[in-house]
Interface confidence: low
């Protein structure tokens, strides 16, 4: 039978009664257009809408813009458009919301083609009252927030000026010219770059990096000749055109670019493209794209440097720069990533790591399933996970993977069954345990999202026709109960709850369709009367992540130790509650070869521990670059991977000798760099 | 105008290979899917599989799997079906259709099925000793 | 695999008068239902999508209905032009099936 639809499914008690009890409708008074949303705060319950229609005139395109506020989580919404002087917001660069509890909200207008600046209207008020204030230039990105200090914002104008504020974009102040691209990085520092001749474009490969610690009263230059730059942890990236030819390689700083370091990694030509898949002040997950149209590429991962790294997948998908790839984080659980790779014969299959990148595994086929049509093997197969490659190729795919850091172990995710990814319309399923065991939690796409720290799973079905039914579970999709929660139903376009996944509130937002008129709609459904009472110490079980194996002494070691979790029991129907903290308890492992990847010039042989030299490499030096610097390298091979915080047991020795030559980099070093101030 | 077009007849004996091509035009090649349907003389429609010009990736009905297989060329815009070990069965129509395959293209919401929407002329092919 | 079940076989109608076909699925296919015209030495032609959906071109005395596992294919008026083989065609789950096809012809 279908997942919840057996004998041992407990009805949960009037169900139907509470919840009615707690739907609330608000009908916008909205022709039908866009509609955005937007969560101001954490546990504020403050939601701001911006819907925007648009009428095409014959000369011109005429829009119009209502904003709406609600402070109760989205049960009741008021038309704030008037503390925006009814003006048209462009939805291009959506709402700003500041970072943390700032209560900063910045929207962006429509001006008329002849004014001299843009104009924006801001709140530091959780949207309670907004100030209009008229830009001195015409904004090409959205506001970008420092975020050590919600009061400091840069932009980046049409004309390629980078503006920066600082008092909530009261003044602002062109700070420089001929920017491409400007991030904030730690401390209130700017990183972006410049070109000198014709534009952006033409200049590729021969920007300027730049950097400012005091809002553009001084500068520095910190490398030239850049084509990007990204950062990622406490990782600064940037990739340089080498001197002789058109390829580029990746240099790494973790000084804000005052040393940088050439990464051990494959040069890439003008077609292919480098990608910070993952970061974290450890380690760095990166995509190096393969010559030619292929649409894949090799992940490597980093040492805690950024330097050296090692092959960690092939073939991995990814389509093309800014394209799709499949790579997702498992937040639900340390050291999980699921991603697709492109096999030779062009399938695509699903790939899965539980040691941060150490080596990848395909997710076992769910006990419930049976192989489709792609699997040769009727009998043996694996579930591939739907993400982004999927939906980009219109599948039938509502979502991307779900899994929430204080939800822990759940993963959530449409699928299918057989040797690689099918275009056939694929079901929902669910691990309870970080991706190791997976099971059919939904027949048929489903929209889906997590409540009360995965007290509540909430579903709807992905569907053409309006819909009136929401199904929600309270025991880790295993059983599921059906609520219809209005009459007339209403063309589905979203689940929205808030971030964080603590709250036990979801807005269903739909439009209603008649012969003359369409209207946005939305339902709010509060399930905190399903959850009746808090939960207590009983409720909660001790599980041991990554365990696979429970004779084994190490069983549950990653990443060199072990974490015990108190979790929620399946069969629990209570409230963790919006102050829920995952509770968890580590101990350090010994030491194994698995806590250690390969060195550079090393790789592990398929099913093998050990690291072995790369034939290629075999009785050469290694030598690398090291803040400009060549380093000679004396290894046996191994090198302890980021984080991994293992003691005692077996310790391979690394050493590194400094030969004190100058690398052969032609990045800026640190002693031709320069300093200006304005 | 929006069109498929399959390559001529074919005769063919028991145990032999054919391989039928269909070429695409007046739309965005990768942008749909390809199915590939057969007919046998005074029976129904027979759906063989399905291929994804993007990637390559195919799937195929039971049936057919291990005898048949689809390819594409994205350069020439061209699908192939080869089908191998051919019997006297095999004798049939074969057409390609393009196959949104769940892709929206504007519905109120989500996605649904949209129906293979343009169709080949069909290549007869016939398996006689 | 989904089987599709077609009925009747033949229907016989006069021309002007309605024409209603039915296909039943072995399981729900949700509203993933085409049906398609097929006239003799012809490739198939879409007329619905979706259950319900005409397709481009397609005159409007051509109707779909149902979702799950009935569904109804509906000629209001028929015109001699309409006399053909029409199948029903799911694509729920793979693989892709099609019904046997009725054949609507002139009584």
């Known amino acids: 039978s279908a997942p919840g639809e057996d004998e041992e499914c407990g009805r949960v008690r009037d169900f139907v009664a509470k919840l009615a009890n707690n739907t609330h409708q608000h009908v916008f008074d909205d022709l039908r257009g866009s509609v955005s949303l937007s969560w101001v705060g954490d546990s504020t319950g403050v939601i701001l809408v911006l819907t925007t229609f648009h009428v095409p005139l014959v000369i011109m395109t005429f829009g119009q813009s209502k904003l709406y506020r609600s402070e109760d989580y989205g049960k009741n919404f008021k038309d704030i458009t008037d503390l925006i002087n009814n003006t048209f917001i462009r939805t291009e660069f959506g709402m700003a919301i500041g970072p943390e509890n700032s209560g900063k909200v910045v929207l962006t207008a429509e001006v008329s083609g002849g004014s001299r600046g843009g104009r924006i209207f801001r709140s530091s008020d959780f949207a309670k009252n907004f100030v209009q204030t008229d830009l001195p230039f015409h904004p090409l990105t959205q506001m970008m927030y420092s975020p050590q200090n919600s009061d400091y914002l840069l932009a980046l104008s049409t004309e390629n000026g980078l503006w920066v504020s600082k008092n909530f974009g009261g003044k602002w102040e062109e700070i420089h010219k001929a920017v491409c691209l400007a991030k904030w990085g730690s401390d209130n520092t700017i990183f972006f770059t410049t070109y000198a001749n014709g534009s952006c474009k033409a200049d590729l490969g021969a920007l300027e990096l730049w950097r400012t610690s005091d809002l553009g009263k001084s500068f520095k230059t910190i490398g030239v000749k850049i084509y990007s730059f990204g950062l990622g942890g406490r990782f600064l990236f940037a990739s340089v055109m080498a001197d002789k030819d058109t390829t580029r390689r990746i240099h790494v700083s973790t000084d804000q670019g005052d040393t940088w370091s050439m990464a051990q990694l494959p040069s890439v030509g003008q077609e292919q493209f480098y990608s910070i898949l993952a970061a974290n002040d450890d380690m760095v997950f990166m995509h190096v794209d393969e010559p030619g149209d292929t649409g894949f590429g090799t992940i490597f991962t980093s040492d805690d440097r950024g330097i050296v790294y090692s092959k960690s997948l092939d073939r991995h998908l990814y389509t093309t720069t800014g394209g799709e790839t499949d790579f997702t984080n498992v937040t639900s659980l340390r050291g999980v990533y699921i991603t697709s790779v492109l096999s030779e014969d062009n399938s695509i299959q699903t790939m899965i790591t539980f040691d941060q990148g150490g080596r990848w595994t395909h997710l076992r086929k769910p006990e419930n399933s049976e192989c489709d049509a792609t699997a040769k093997n009727k009998n043996e197969c694996s579930l591939h996970i739907h993400a982004s490659y999927s939906i980009s190729q219109k599948l039938n795919v509502p979502m991307a993977p779900l899994s929430e850091p204080n939800a822990v172990g759940i993963v959530i995710a449409h699928g299918s069954v057989g040797d690689a990814i099918s275009v056939m319309v694929p079901d929902v399923y669910i691990s309870d345990d970080g991706g190791y065991s997976w099971t059919k939690m939904l027949e048929g796409p489903h929209y889906y999202t997590i409540l009360d720290s995965g007290g509540i799973i909430v579903a709807i079905e992905h569907s053409s026709r309006p819909i009136n039914v929401i199904k929600f579970s309270t025991d880790e999709g295993q059983c599921w109960q059906t609520y219809t929660f209005t009459r007339d139903p209403i063309y589905f376009t979203g689940l929205a709850s808030e971030p964080g996944a603590r709250s036990m509130n979801i807005s269903i937002w739909g439009f209603t369709e008649s012969f003359l008129t369409s209207q946005w709609v939305s339902y709010t459904i509060d399930f905190k009367d399903i959850l009746e009472r808090n939960c207590e110490e009983k409720d909660y079980t001790i599980w041991l992540a990554h365990s696979t194996d429970p004779e084994d002494y190490e069983d549950g070691c990653i990443l060199g130790y072990k974490e015990q979790f108190l979790r929620l029991r399946k069969s629990s129907v209570c409230q963790n509650g919006r102050d829920y903290v995952v509770t968890k308890q580590p101990s350090i492992c010994l030491c194994s070869l698995e806590d250690f990847l390969c060195d550079f010039g090393y790789y592990r042989p398929e099913n093998d521990s050990k690291c072995v030299e790369q034939p290629e490499l075999k009785g050469h030096d290694l030598e690398f670059c090291l803040y400009g610097r060549e380093e000679h390298l004396t290894t046996n091979g191994y090198r302890k991977i980021p984080g991994d915080k293992c003691q005692g047991g077996v310790n391979p020795v690394r050493e590194v000798k400094d030969l004190k030559k100058k690398c052969t980099s032609n990045f800026l070093s640190p002693e031709k760099q320069n300093s200006k101030s304005n | 105008q929006v069109q498929l077009v399959q390559s001529g007849a074919e005769v063919k004996k028991p145990g032999a290979s054919v391989k039928v091509s269909c070429k695409a035009s007046?739309?965005?090649?990768?942008?749909?899917?390809m199915s590939w349907v057969r007919q046998a003389p005074g029976q129904g429609l027979e759906w063989m599989g399905i291929?994804?010009?993007?990637?390559?990736?195919?799937s195929y009905a039971q049936k057919f799997q291990g005898r048949v297989t689809m390819t594409r060329d994205t350069s020439t815009s061209t699908v192939y079906m080869e089908l191998s070990s051919l019997r006297s069965e095999d004798t049939a129509v074969y057409y390609c259709?393009?196959?949104?395959?769940?892709?929206?293209?504007?519905?109120?919401?989500?996605?649904?099925?949209?129906?293979?929407?343009?169709w080949g002329q069909g290549t007869t092919v016939t398996v006689s000793s | 695999e989904i089987v599709m079940t077609q009925s009747p076989a033949t229907l016989s109608v006069s021309p002007g008068e309605r024409a209603t076909l039915s296909c039943r699925a072995s399981?729900?296919?949700?509203?993933?239902l085409a049906w398609y015209q097929q006239k003799p030495g012809q490739a198939p032609r879409l007329l619905i999508y979706?259950?319900?959906t005409r397709a481009t071109g397609i005159p409007a005395r051509f109707s779909g209905s149902g979702s799950g596992t009935e569904f109804t294919l509906t000629i209001s008026s028929l015109q001699s032009e309409d006399f053909a083989v029409y199948y029903c065609?799911?694509?729920?789950?793979?693989?892709?099936?099609f019904g046997g096809g009725t054949k609507v012809e002139i009584k």
């Open positions: 007046g739309y965005t090649f990768t942008s749909r899917y």
């Open positions: 065609q799911q694509a729920r789950l793979g693989p892709w099936t």
């Open positions: 399981q729900s296919v949700s509203s993933n």
């Open positions: 259709a393009r196959d949104p395959s769940g892709i929206a293209l504007a519905g109120p919401a989500g996605r649904y099925y949209y129906g293979m929407d343009v």
């Open positions: 291929i994804n010009p993007v990637g390559g990736s195919t």
């Open positions: 979706g259950a319900s």
